[in-house]
Amino acid sequence: HHHHHHHHHHSGGGGSGGGGSGGGGSKGVEPKTESERLAGTESPVREEPGEDFPAARRLYWDDLKRKLSEKLDSTDFTGTIKLLNENSYVPREAGSQKDENLALYVENQFREFKLSKVWRDQHFVKIQVKDSIGQNMVTIVQSNGNLDPVESPEGYVAFSKPTEVSGKLVHANFGTKKDFEELSYSVNGSLVIVRAGEITFAEKVANAQSFNAIGVLIYMDKNKFPVVEADLALFGHAHLGTGDPYTPGFPSFNHTQFPPSQSSGLPNIPVQTISRAAAEKLFGKMEGSCPARWNIDSSCKLELSQNQNVKLIVKNVLKEIKILNIFGVIKGFVEPDHYVVVGAQRDAWGPGAAKSGVGTALLLKLAQMFSDMVLKDGFQPSRSIIFASWSAGDFGSVGATEWLEGYLSSLHLKAFTYINLDKAVLGTSNFKVSASPLLYTLIEKTMQNVKHPVTGQFLYQDSNWASKVEKLTLDNAAFPFLAYSGIPAVSFCFCEDTDYPYLGTTMDTYKELIERIPELNKVARAAAEVAGQFVIKLTHDVELNLDYEMYNSKLLSFMKDLNQFKTDIRDMGLSLQWLYSARGDYFRATSRLTTDFHNAEKTNRFVMREINDRIMKVEYHFLSPYVSPRESPFRHIFWGSGSHTLSALVENLKLRQKNITAFNETLFRNQLALATWTIQGVANALSGDIWNIDNEF
């Protein structure tokens, strides 16, 4: 059930060469008229009203790339990954003593690295754990009423509805919407058994619920997860959202007065993970072979034999825990109030070597290397770099989302990119990436500069790579940054075409990881080089490395999708003229900004600040202003979820062609109008001051 379905890329990162470069250059100093807070910290810098950038020797891209590469060469990643897998830090479920132990270790390391400032945010959040007394249980109820125990699973699914259900059991493959639609039998009133993978647990449960299933069992089948241990337990969560589901849309700082509230993404049915052995025991009582197209092992069966039922008892309980997010910042030299955030999940239900150990090790090493580059090597990043260690990631990016919720109104004006380090090393064959289109150009440049750790070829092998990039998924910590906060985000991994089989299990150990990836240090080095080059490019250059022109092609492909429905739209007496106009305005705004940039005096920090401020707002303005962040947190019209998204609008139109009685025309009219005005809003924001906007629209 891991989430890196990013774009496949055969190649990768080893040594990034890079020749030296001398000479002077220019470095900007950013004026600010008032004290500003680094989100979650105070970091005001009142500055002199200044003229142009002072001419001082400046490290260039080649120098920095080489410095980073040299540091990477002498860094022991595996030692740190192994250290994080030691008993004092394992297992480290969110809020546990061992999670706190590791938090303190990270905090101390940040201090030792001499980051400009190190701090922590404390949150009180509700998670769901197994009851210490009552056991979760799966049982077969025979026709004569006899109970045949199947399993009292060691694993569980957080945020399941704690209840007891009985009914028929049917298989629904991965539990995708398509899987449910293609079943030859009804799941109404039945429990469903689904295999892990393809989509998140939360989506599986939501889909099952929408088809009126009464409960869900999740297991790892042998084909997708070729694990020898058939009794291996599995953990996950079922919240169709991120953050603390009991404080939706607002942060759970201790001083917040919580109104009683809960996320609409919590399931109304019980869900439980079971081992493969338990699943096979159930299949022994079931009939009907699973379709060949499922590509599933032969033990799979479709429906429980007549006159038998399955009983699922889930006794999970809510628990309030204290979590710590640990932060360290390297303060920027020019625009310290603008920052890139590099983050990694710290907690894990099991040992979490691949799930949170690698990311945390990368986070620590990157913090150390960049601090070193500043203190010893003369690197002067224009913008700040925040390193963040999140807790409760295993419960739906809780720590990260709580931080975002705490600073929702201002964060997008300050944090301009999020780089996710979670699960960055799961294999070696492919380099996969998911990101905001604003980062595609940066990603491409990086892939042209980083070599694959095993093949030695540059990661950039396919000029068409961007068209294969998959959307960030709900279980990726980068998702709330992009879809909730409107901050461009990127997540990447070195991984295989197959899922890493031990995520969310007690076998996610350093021992298994190094066995599966003997070149672990090299691969971790490559992952660090990718992230490191992102950081340098995003903080060093005078102009912000966010390619706002990339959304032109996204808008164009949306228009193409809509064009298929020209007749339907005309039949409703509607026109796409205004949408075309809004898209055209966006295109013109991007062209104008590019011209402004080319004509700008690069050494004039006021002009550059104004241009960068316009660029920084692009992603945020793709958040629909017409829905409430509390009811529909993922407001991004491209990457979010809900009726305000462009994909929902297209789906609604498809429904008109498929089943006109199910089509909601009023909803569609709203969707079209609001999408038009959201896109127009982005164009206006990019155009700059109000008097520069052509209001003939």
Epitope: K27, V29, S35, S43, P44, V45, R46, P54, A56, R57, N108, R111, E112, K114, S116, K117, V118, W119, K331, G332, F333, P336, V374, L375, K376, G378, Q380
Partner: antibody, heavy 118, light 106 residues
């Protein structure tokens, strides 16, 4: 409350060594950098170097490499600075100071006077 | 090394007068700290991260600046402000202090 207690004044011969101490209390000794600063009579302040007692990681001002050696004893929460091959220009008051965020030296010892004289 | 030049070296001000002293660095820094030292005592942290006042420092003090140029200002001089003020950078090794500005009262 945070306190840094330094050892007493030293009168030493040229060419010899001296080891001055700085005992920390009131905070987690292993979690903060501890720096050393030199001040000659009537002169300004000079940063000598610092130590992170949790790992014994040290940084030195190039100018003081070979002259100063920084160590720390976790069990007694005490930091030490040994000055070797002493000469008259080493006569100064030496301060230890704890460093927090933004490398702000927020707590200081009272200073140890070292006089090098034959 | 990053040389910090403080000016003036010595200055005197009348009570109630506004006082500004500067610190210029030979290369950019991302923040500046200031210390106050009165004769025969250890230095005290006075301003950190360019503009934040250390605990117990009167509100008449302020700090500002960026890049290579920083300043400490006293809005209204008082007798107890007589001291030597040192700027300090921790942005790159070796960390360095300025030569100090000695503030006297007229």
């Amino acid at each position: 409350q945070v306190q840094l207690q330094q050892s007493g004044a030293e009168l030493v011969r040229p060419g010899t060594s001296v080891k001055i101490s700085c005992k920390a209390s009131g905070y987690a000794f292993t979690n903060y950098w501890l720096g050393w600063v030199k001040q000659r009579p009537g002169h300004g302040l000079e940063w000598i170097g610092d130590i992170f007692p949790g790992s014994d990681n040290t940084y030195y001002n190039e100018k003081f490499k070979g002259k100063a050696t920084l160590t720390a004893d976790k069990s007694s929460s005490t930091a030490y600075m040994q000055l070797s091959s002493l000469a008259s220009e080493d006569s100064a008051v030496y301060f230890c100071a704890r460093s927090g965020n933004f490398y702000a030296m927020d707590y200081w010892g009272q200073g140890t006077s070292v006089t090098v004289s034959s | 090394e990053n040389v910090l030049t403080q000016s003036p070296a010595i200055m005197s001000a009348s009570p109630g007068e506004k006082v500004t002293m500067t610190c210029s660095a030979s290369s950019s820094v991302n923040y500046m700290n200031w210390y106050q030292q009165k004769s025969s005592t250890f230095p005290k942290l006075w301003i950190y991260d360019t503009s934040k006042l250390a605990s117990g420092v009167p509100g008449r003090f302020s700090g500002s600046g960026s890049g290579k140029f920083y300043s400490l200002t006293i809005s209204s001089m008082e007798a107890e402000d007589v001291a030597t003020y040192y700027c300090f950078q921790g942005s790159g090794y070796p960390f360095t202090f300025g030569s100090g500005t000695k503030l006297e009262i007229k």
